[in-house]
Interface confidence: medium
C-alpha cells in the first residue's frame, strides 16, 4: 500500500493528446504504473505507461490518435485513472473526471522566423501547432525577448490579447544578438494554462549605418 498525498494533473492539447503528471509522497519503489483514459461517449480507451520525471513524480502522454485529429469535444468527459501494479492485480491510485476543454494546454508555437529585421526593430512570425478549430480566433499569446546580460526570467512579458501570429519588436539595440520566445493559451477553460515556451529564435539586429545617429 502507498501512503502520502497524491496529485494527479492532466492537460489536453485540444486535438489528440492528454499529458498527465502524477506525484506521490512516499514514493513507489520499482512499481509499474499507468494512466488509463475511459471516455464517456467514445468507442476507444487509451493507456500510457507512467515514467519517472523526478523522485516522486511520473509523467506520460495519452496519444489518442493522429496529431491533428479532433478526438474530443467540449462535451466530453474522460475518466482518468492512475493504476499501479500490486502483485497480480492493478490498484487505482488516483482518479479524476477530466473535462478536456476545461483543462487545456496547447503545444508550444512552432516555425518561428524573422520576417524582417532592422537596426532597432524586428518583425517575427510563428505558427500554432495542433490547435483545435473550435477556438476560432479565441487565443492569446505571450512573448519575451532575451537581451544580452539578462535571463529569461528577467525578460518583460509582451501580451497579445488576440490570435496574432506575429509581433514587431521595437526599441532594440543595433548589432545585438537577441533571442525570442512565444507561448499560447486558449481563452476557454477553467483550468487552462499556458503552453510551454517555444524553442528560442535567435536573431541579430542590423548594425547602425556609419555616420548615422543611433
Amino acid at each position: 500500500a502507498v501512503n502520502g498525498t497524491s496529485q494527479f494533473t492532466c492537460f489536453y492539447n485540444s486535438r489528440a493528446n492528454i499529458s498527465c503528471v502524477w506525484s506521490q509522497d512516499g514514493a513507489l519503489q520499482d512499481t509499474s504504473c499507468q494512466v488509463h483514459a475511459w471516455p464517456d461517449r467514445r468507442r476507444w480507451n487509451q493507456t500510457c505507461e507512467l515514467l519517472p520525471v523526478s523522485q516522486a513524480s511520473w509523467a506520460c502522454n495519452l496519444i489518442l490518435g493522429a496529431p491533428d485529429s479532433q478526438k474530443l469535444t467540449t462535451v466530453d468527459i474522460v475518466t482518468l485513472r492512475v493504476l499501479c501494479r500490486e502483485g497480480v492485480r492493478w490498484r487505482v491510485m488516483a482518479i479524476q473526471d477530466f473535462k478536456p476543454f476545461e483543462n487545456l494546454r496547447l503545444m508550444a508555437p512552432i516555425s518561428l522566423q524573422v520576417v524582417h529585421v532592422e537596426t532597432h526593430r524586428c518583425n517575427i512570425s510563428w505558427e500554432i501547432s495542433q490547435a483545435s478549430h473550435y477556438f476560432e480566433r479565441h487565443l492569446e499569446f505571450e512573448a519575451r525577448t532575451l537581451s544580452p546580460g539578462h535571463t529569461w526570467e528577467e525578460a518583460p512579458l509582451l501580451t497579445l490579447k488576440q490570435k496574432q501570429e506575429w509581433i514587431c519588436l521595437e526599441t532594440l539595440t543595433p548589432d545585438t544578438q537577441y533571442e525570442f520566445q512565444v507561448r499560447v493559451k486558449p481563452l476557454q477553460g477553467e483550468f487552462t494554462t499556458w503552453s510551454p515556451w517555444s524553442q528560442p529564435l535567435a536573431f541579430r539586429t542590423k548594425p547602425a549605418a556609419l555616420g548615422k545617429d543611433t
Partner: antibody
C-alpha cells in the same frame, strides 16, 4: 450480478423536498457513472443527470439548481436530492448504469420509485 | 438540446409483420440507442451504438441509420413485443429520448 434498487419515493407537497436512494450491487460506484432518469405518468423518459466515477456531476438544465446527485462510496449508494418540488416533478424515478463502456447505453436499470407531488 | 422525434407515435400490426420505427434528431448525432418498455416495467436496452444488439436480445430486433435519421426494425412481430419503444442519443448533453412509439397487436 449488477443490480440497482431505488427507494425513498412517496407523496410530498409542492415546495417540499425528498431524497431518493439508489443502492448498487455487483459493481462499485467509483468505477462507473450512474444516471438518474424519470418518467412522468403516461409520458416519455427524461434524463436528469449523472455522477461520474470520479465523483463529478452533470445535470440537465431543466433541474439544475433544484436537484443534486451525490453518493456514499462506503454504502455503494447514489442519492438524488430534490428540492422545491413541483407538481410536474411527479414521476417514476430510475437510476441506471451503462454497460462496460459508457457508450453501451443504459444496460442496467433499477425498478423505479414513484414520487407524487401534490397538496 | 437535441430533440428526438419518433414516428409513428403508435402502431398496430399483426403477429409476424415487419415493424419499422424511425427517429429523427434535430441535429446530427453519432450513435443511437433503442429501448423497450413494457407496462409497469423499467426500460430494457435493445440496441446500442446504432446497430449492435444488447446481450440476450432476439435477432428479430435491428437498428440502422446515421446523421439525423435512424431506424429500428422488428423483422417479425411477436406477442411479447407489445411495448413502448424509445430512441435515445448519447452524442451531447443533456441526453435525450424520443417521445416513444407504442406497439400493439392487431
Amino acid at each position: 450480478e449488477v443490480q440497482l434498487l431505488e427507494s425513498g419515493g412517496g407523496l410530498v407537497q409542492p415546495g417540499g423536498s425528498l431524497r431518493l436512494s439508489c443502492a448498487a450491487s455487483g459493481f462499485s460506484v467509483t468505477s462507473y457513472g450512474v444516471h438518474w432518469i424519470r418518467q412522468a405518468p403516461g409520458k416519455g423518459l427524461e434524463w436528469l443527470g449523472a455522477i461520474w466515477s470520479g465523483g463529478s456531476t452533470q445535470y440537465n438544465a431543466a433541474v439544475k439548481g433544484r436537484f443534486t446527485i451525490s453518493r456514499d462510496n462506503s454504502k455503494n449508494t447514489l442519492y438524488l436530492q430534490m428540492n422545491s418540488l413541483r407538481a410536474e416533478d411527479t414521476a417514476v424515478y430510475y437510476c441506471a448504469r451503462a454497460g462496460d463502456a459508457n457508450y453501451d447505453g443504459f444496460a442496467y436499470w433499477g425498478q423505479g420509485t414513484l414520487v407524487t407531488v401534490s397538496s | 438540446d437535441i430533440q428526438m422525434t419518433q414516428s409513428p407515435s403508435s402502431l398496430s400490426a399483426s403477429v409476424g409483420d415487419r415493424v419499422t420505427i424511425t427517429c429523427q434528431a434535430s441535429s446530427s448525432v453519432s450513435f443511437m440507442y433503442w429501448y423497450q418498455q413494457r407496462p409497469g416495467k423499467a426500460p430494457r436496452l435493445l440496441i446500442y451504438d446504432t446497430s449492435n444488439l444488447a446481450s440476450g436480445v432476439p435477432s428479430r430486433f435491428s437498428g440502422s441509420g446515421s446523421g439525423t435519421s435512424y431506424t429500428f426494425t422488428i423483422s417479425s412481430l411477436q406477442p411479447e413485443d407489445i411495448a413502448t419503444y424509445y430512441c435515445q442519443q448519447w452524442s451531447t448533453y443533456p441526453l435525450t429520448f424520443g417521445q416513444g412509439t407504442k406497439v400493439e397487436i392487431k
